[in-house]
């Protein structure tokens, strides 16, 4: 958010900028957070938009029976683990073609046991609400997936007639890792030092983050001809004068007409 | 790059015999396996033979006791005897090679290649 300056009082501007905005020769350029000539004033409402995609991580072990095991594929630098990788990837793509989710595979550690392949499946799902029931469904045909391909793809009399055989008993899911995401916790964090004064709404399944200062959700203050505006504190109203009244109160809903204090001040004088 | 290339290939009656040899441009495979691989018009290509560095061979069944897989380190060759030889072993044959200790005959599994010699088994 930048707020332009033009005139004289500019220069003076410059080492004003407030809530480490920076001046740029024009203006103060404000953090996320803030805005205004000197980035004094808070936002109302902060961009948590839930991210495009969602990410899973299956750890999975298998072992690979038609490559014996050297120790040159400990050295993911070699040729022998170049050409492991790429045989074991292909083979993989091969196992996990009919899962939208699927993105591909990534080797951590080969080690010995014929090969035992220590990798990660990679999954993503683009959001929606329903993200974690996708990528639950997702993660369990995995699982039907190699499991199948591990007891079908075996050595007959030691020669395999597949890309690749396997170990039938080799075969195991360690973890699975879904990228959380909480709006809450997005907005409180981005929020900072206002983090307790700042909620999640949602509309049409979108979450916004908003302070009460921003109109049209059940949390809005209403300050009615006063502005909002927020505070290490809270959100407060501060009241307007205009021509006829003074406002006062909490949500500036006390008025009080001028004409009517200035005829009581003459009646003192 | 790795090179292979084949040779030894021909015209040869049924019963009759041949040495296929492959010359590998360097010795980088010495340490993994190499094997012969064919394909005869209209049909996939098939594994033949096997050798792997630490001396294990395997074969297609097709193909046992009739044909021999050697390999030569120190001319950083591979051979394939093939004796009584049938109609049905009329084929374009390759080399192959691959970095690791394979027990595979299945193509998809070896990423070298030579570009093939034409056998053909007929009277």
């Known amino acids: 958010r930048t707020t332009t300056c033009f005139g004289d009082g500019c220069q003076n501007t410059a080492s004003r900028c407030k809530n480490g905005g920076t001046w740029d020769g024009l203006k103060c350029q404000c953090p996320n957070l803030y805005y205004g000539e000197l980035c004094e004033e808070v936002v109302s409402s902060i961009d948590i938009g839930p991210p495009e995609t969602i990410s899973a991580q299956m750890e999975l072990t298998v072992t690979v029976t038609s490559v014996k095991f050297t120790e040159e594929l400990k050295n993911h630098s070699s040729q022998e683990f170049q050409e492991f990788k790429q045989t074991f990837t292909e083979q993989m793509n091969i196992v996990y073609s009919g899962i939208p989710e699927y993105v591909g595979v990534n080797i951590t550690k080969l080690r010995l046991g014929s090969v035992v392949v220590e990798h990660d499946v990679l999954l993503r799902t683009k959001y929606t609400p329903e993200y974690k029931t996708v990528l639950d469904n997702a993660t369990e045909v995995v699982k039907e997936k190699i499991t199948k391909v591990t007891t079908q793809q075996i050595m007959i009399n030691d020669i395999c007639s597949d890309m690749m055989c396997f170990n039938t008993t080799g075969t195991q899911v360690q973890n699975i890792t879904v990228t959380q995401y909480d709006p809450e916790e997005d907005c409180r964090k981005m929020a900072k030092e206002y983090g307790d004064y700042f909620v999640v709404e949602y509309r049409d399944q979108k979450p916004y983050c908003i302070s009460p200062c921003e109109p049209g959700f059940s949390v809005s203050k209403n300050c009615n001809l006063g502005k909002c505006q927020m505070s290490l504190s809270g959100p407060q109203c501060l009241c307007v004068t205009t021509e006829t009244h003074w406002y006062s109160g909490e949500t500036c809903n006390q008025g009080t007409q001028k004409s009517l204090v200035y005829g009581h001040h003459h009646h003192h004088h | 790059d790795v090179q292979l290339v084949e040779s030894g290939g021909g015209l040869v009656q049924p019963g009759g015999s041949l040495r296929l040899s492959c010359a590998a441009s360097d010795n980088t495979f010495s340490r993994g396996s190499m094997s012969w691989f064919r394909q005869a018009p209209g049909k996939e290509r098939e594994g033949v033979a096997i050798?792997?560095?630490?001396?294990?061979?395997g074969y297609a069944d097709s193909v046992k006791g009739r044909f021999t897989i050697s390999q030569d380190n120190a001319k950083n060759s591979l051979y394939l005897q093939m004796n009584s030889l049938r109609a049905e072993d009329t084929a374009m044959y390759y080399c192959?090679?691959?970095?690791?200790?394979?027990?595979?005959?299945?193509?998809?599994?070896?990423?070298?290649w030579g570009q093939g010699t034409q056998v053909t088994v007929s009277s």
């Open positions: 050798i792997s560095s630490d001396g294990w061979t």
């Open positions: 192959a090679a691959s970095f690791l200790v394979l027990r595979a005959l299945n193509p998809k599994a070896w990423h070298y």
